[in-house]
């Protein structure tokens, strides 16, 4: 079968890292510099992604695989394949269209990315505030006063913070 297919299409013999060159009677030519083909039988090689500006090269391009980018210090990746780099902020801040802004009272952000989220409302679980929240940290909820009896555990660990999803830009 492989031989039959080759007689029909000489390009099928060209391996990854090469292309079927119409200018040279369909012989298999190596991909030009800064280009690649990740599968066999290709009639062109794809130009490598260039990690420029706030992007930096995480993985160099080879003749058979594309380059991969991440972000320079002070930025973090957004989107599949690190399609964008977004500016880092400090803990206790969120990125707005006007730059990094402190979290409003009653909200916090414990990371360099993402949005400020509301403090946990301890009373919804019938608990009381054991440690006050800050711009950087959520409140710590403790047991309700009724639960405070000798020998009872005094602190309930807070639920782990969920990382909100990011929409590009």
């Amino acid at each position: 079968f492989e031989r039959t297919r080759s007689l029909q299409d000489p390009c099928s013999n060209c391996p990854a890292g090469t292309f079927c060159d119409n200018n040279r009677n369909q012989i298999c030519s190596p991909c030009p510099p800064n280009s690649f083909s990740s599968a066999g039988g290709q009639r062109t090689c794809d130009i490598c992604r260039q990690c420029k500006g706030v992007f930096r090269t995480r993985k160099e391009c080879s003749s058979t695989s594309n380059a991969e980018c991440d972000c320079t210090p002070g930025f973090h990746c957004l989107g599949a394949g690190c399609s964008m780099c977004e500016q880092d902020c400090k803990q206790g801040q969120e990125l707005t269209k006007k730059g990094c802004k402190d979290c409003c009272f009653g909200t916090f952000n414990d990371q360099k990315r993402g949005i400020c989220r509301p403090w946990t409302n301890c009373s919804l679980d019938g608990k009381s505030v054991l440690v006050n929240g800050t711009k950087e940290r959520d409140v710590v909820c403790g047991p309700s006063p009724a639960d405070l009896s000798p020998g009872a555990s005094s602190v309930t660990p807070p639920a782990p913070a969920r990382e909100p999803g990011h929409s590009p830009q």
């Epitope: 062109t44 794809d46 260039q50 990690c51 420029k52 500006g53």
Partner: antibody, heavy 118, light 112 residues
Framework: QVQLQESGPGLVKPSETLSLTCTVS????????WSWIRQPPGKGLEWIGY???????NYNPSLKSRVTISVDTSKNQFSLKLSSVTAADTAVYYC????????????WGQGTLVTVSS | EIVMTQSPLSLPVTPGEPASISCRSS???????????LDWYLQKPGQSPQLLIY???NRASGVPDRFSGSGSGTDFTLKISRVEAEDVGVYYC?????????FGQGTKLEIK
């Protein structure tokens, strides 16, 4: 091999919204940037903007307030909307595969002429 | 944005003779990885543009070797060693360093 095909109305009235779709065949829309470029009759080329398959976008500042580019990976398509058009938006509109997010347009559609006229 | 300037804007050439097109950018296109973010495109009459050269000097796969690109920084040249009738059209240089990518005005190559 990768092929791109633009589709949409050839005539749009002034102040209305121009809408075009680019269908990608012979390859997946994933892992690349996809651009729109236009060319007014008898003039040069102008980049409009790109979208990455994940939805990230970047637009030419000169058109940013009027442009929206979106992607539908399930249909292997991406689309252009240009609002509040005038006669100056009359052009051949091309979609192209963008290898690096604003560079090296290796695969182009055949282009579609959009005329803005009442 | 980066401004691209081409010369000449019109280029009559006899078949078999060489041709040369110049492109100048308003700022350097040489990036820190020693990569010049400069592409050359040919738009044949009634067709879409096609990529000829990327990174200043790399021929795209399938492009005849009579086309070559050279230069670095702000000054670039596209050369055709022996012009053929099928080479007629408008040649554009484009900078790909910064968004928005910007094109030169175009050079129209015609056969004498």
């Amino acid at each position: 091999q990768v092929q791109l095909q633009e589709s949409g109305p050839g005539l749009v009235k002034p102040s209305e919204t121009l809408s075009l779709t680019c269908t990608v065949s012979g390859g997946s829309i994933s892992s690349y940037y996809w651009s729109w470029i236009r060319q007014p009759p008898g003039k040069g080329l102008e980049w409009i903007g790109y979208i990455y398959y994940s939805g990230s976008t970047n637009y030419n500042p000169s058109l940013k307030s009027r442009v929206t580019i979106s992607v539908d990976t399930s249909k292997n398509q991406f689309s252009l909307k240009l609002s509040s058009v005038t006669a100056a938006d009359t052009a051949v509109y091309y979609c192209a595969r963008d290898q690096s997010g604003g560079g090296s347009f290796q695969h182009w559609g055949q282009g579609t002429l959009v005329t803005v006229s009442s | 944005e980066i401004v691209m300037t081409q010369s000449p804007l019109s280029l009559p050439v006899t078949p078999g003779e060489p041709a040369s097109i110049s492109c100048r950018s308003s700022q350097s296109l040489l990036y820190s990885n020693a990569y010049n973010h400069l592409d050359w495109y040919l738009q044949k009459p009634g067709q879409s543009p096609q990529l000829l050269i990327y990174a200043g000097s790399n021929r795209a796969s399938g492009v005849p070797d009579r086309f070559s690109g050279s230069g670095s920084g702000t000054d670039f040249t596209l050369k055709i060693s022996r012009v053929e009738a099928e080479d007629v059209g408008v040649y554009y240089c484009m900078q790909a360093l910064q968004t928005p990518p910007t094109f030169g005005q175009g050079t129209k190559l015609e056969i004498k």
